[in-house]
Interface confidence: low
Amino acid sequence: IPVIEPSGPELVVKPGEMVTLRCVGNGSVEWDGPISPHWTLYSDGPSSVLTTTNATFQNTRTYRCTEPGDPLGGSAAIHLYVKDPARPWNVLAKEVVVFEDQDALLPCLLTDPVLEAGVSLVRLRGRPLLRHTNYSFSPWHGFTIHRAKFIQGQDYQCSALMGSRKVMSISIRLKVQKVIPGPPALTLVPEELVRIRGEAAQIVCSASNIDVDFDVFLQHNTTKLAIPQRSDFHDNRYQKVLTLSLGQVDFQHAGNYSCVASNVQGKHSTSMFFRVVESAYLDLSSEQNLIQEVTVGEGLNLKVMVEAYPGLQGFNWTYLGPFSDHQPEPKLANATTKDTYRHTFTLSLPRLKPSEAGCYSFLARNPGGWRALTFELTLRYPPEVSVIWTSINGSGTLLCAASGYPQPNVTWLQCAGHTDRCDEAQVLQVWVDPHPEVLSQEPFQKVTVQSLLTAETLEHNQTYECRAHNSVGSGSWAFIPISAGARTHPPDEFLFTP
């Protein structure tokens, strides 16, 4: 580590005196920073000498000596005061620039350490500091304003009390720059716009930035629009607003509008689409199938998307029948607005009852007229089965009626013994009826089918079961004959499985 003679760390001299500062190290040494012309510099191997024959207040500062070859990078310093009764301050810089929230050092150095007790910082022409200005003083370095704010960017003077009077330094201009976190914030209103040809429209592009140095423009498709700009300042931000007002829109006004703003950090843009239409429109659609099938007892939400301009003047859900004259309860209907021109309407149908199958229509109205979207709701039912013994054309016949939706399939089983239901081990014969007769097939209702099993005689110790099934479930009915007999036979077209 180099050594400075005199040993310091401070040296106080009077103006006009001769000052010699010698730095000695193990290897070659050098003085840091720019040395003013008033000094003579002499280097000789491991020592370097600074000499001035006529010290002035401007020589007041810290002198630092380093040894470039030293791996530890050590340095030595001495602070020289040239105490001039007429010049208590040596100002090293007339302008200081910092970013907001950094410490700002105002480098006015006191030429006489005795004056330290009476120093203060003021604004130009002795005006007091702004409230909440937090600062400290070092006789070697000057005044430090801690965490400088944008508003503290002012002209300052350092003041020293000499006797009974305050002596000011020349002024130092502090510039506090705002930290720009990113591109300006943008809003483009509305996010989407639809107008009928001939109507008025307004599009507002506004941008805000932490400082005034930013640009904003509005672009239609690829064309930059020349619009007068309104500027403002509030909430500690600068605002610039562009308003495009169109008295009577036409098709050429339609298209993409982009609001673009830029600052030193970059560019930010947002877009909206302006659609010009010939006349009012009202479109109803659903992502659901308009033909719905739901199992009885389950719930269903019917959802309709509406695109409309101008806005809706009325809307409602209506049950069109065919079963009852009930209407959907208003509390089950829900409306949400996705944006200005698109809405979603939902009808909730919980725990559906047989009487609630049928047509549900959503109707909406705007100046473009009425539109309707109708859902057909069919309920699914598991099969219900019944078997009766009857005589047809003199022949004994088992008649099975199965009712459900979708249309049930019918299978006959003959099994050993008397039982409520044939299990696989007991089955003697299986007949699948490929074409049971459809007795009724009305819209939104169960389909009823009938299957016949002709029997010359039925065996008394056997059970005949009719089974029906569809996608919802299955049902069965077992028949146990009372009288004894010999055999049964299915119709010719039945599929026989032993």
Partner: antibody, heavy 118, light 108 residues
Framework: EVQLVESGGGLVQPGGSLRLSCAAS????????IHWVRQAPGKGLEWVSV????????YYADSVKGRFTISRDNSKNTLYLQLNSLRAEDTAVYYC???????????WGQGTLVTVSS | DIQLTQSPSSLSASVGDRVTITCRAS???????LAWYQQKPGKAPKLLIY???SLESGVPSRFSGSGSGTDFTLTISSLQPEDFATYYC?????????FGQGTKVEIK
Amino acid sequence: EVQLVESGGGLVQPGGSLRLSCAASGFTFSGYAIHWVRQAPGKGLEWVSVISGYGSSTYYADSVKGRFTISRDNSKNTLYLQLNSLRAEDTAVYYCARDPGVGGFDVWGQGTLVTVSS
Amino acid sequence: DIQLTQSPSSLSASVGDRVTITCRASQSVRRRFLAWYQQKPGKAPKLLIYDASSLESGVPSRFSGSGSGTDFTLTISSLQPEDFATYYCQQYYPIPRTFGQGTKVEIK
């Protein structure tokens, strides 16, 4: 120049995954909904999926629902399609296409080929 | 979903011919939201017509579209050599978007 450029296609085994990208340039990307459309070799066009301009709405064809995921990064002007649980019938050229909101798909990419084969 | 069926599936024509392709929808296409595209081998489709009859910017005026409801038509008034391609109709509202199966126009 307004353009869309797809990438990320290639050969993948059944059950595998792939991520397609579509890079947009020459227009304000966030102002447009973008679709994916595919075309099996020698076949017609099939709509696959769409995502709204700011990514708040996504829709899928029934044939890909639950397997494919559409997304976009407006800061990068890029659209993505994540293809999972791939099947042989997903083999196709995949196109991204811009929806101008006034009708049809006005700008298409050149397409990227996805081949699903063992 | 709306199904679109194009006819014919393919046709042969000569340069200068008037060509008509039809597109039939399984249900009414709302507000004529129907587009026509041209596709050449190895290339992406190109938009010709939107809103059933609006000509896309830069498309030659020999292409025209008409129709509403369920029946739509693309007409090429005088076929040019560069028009030999496959043509698709598409409905673009509501989702899912659906395309016709295509009509291939070949040189006779």
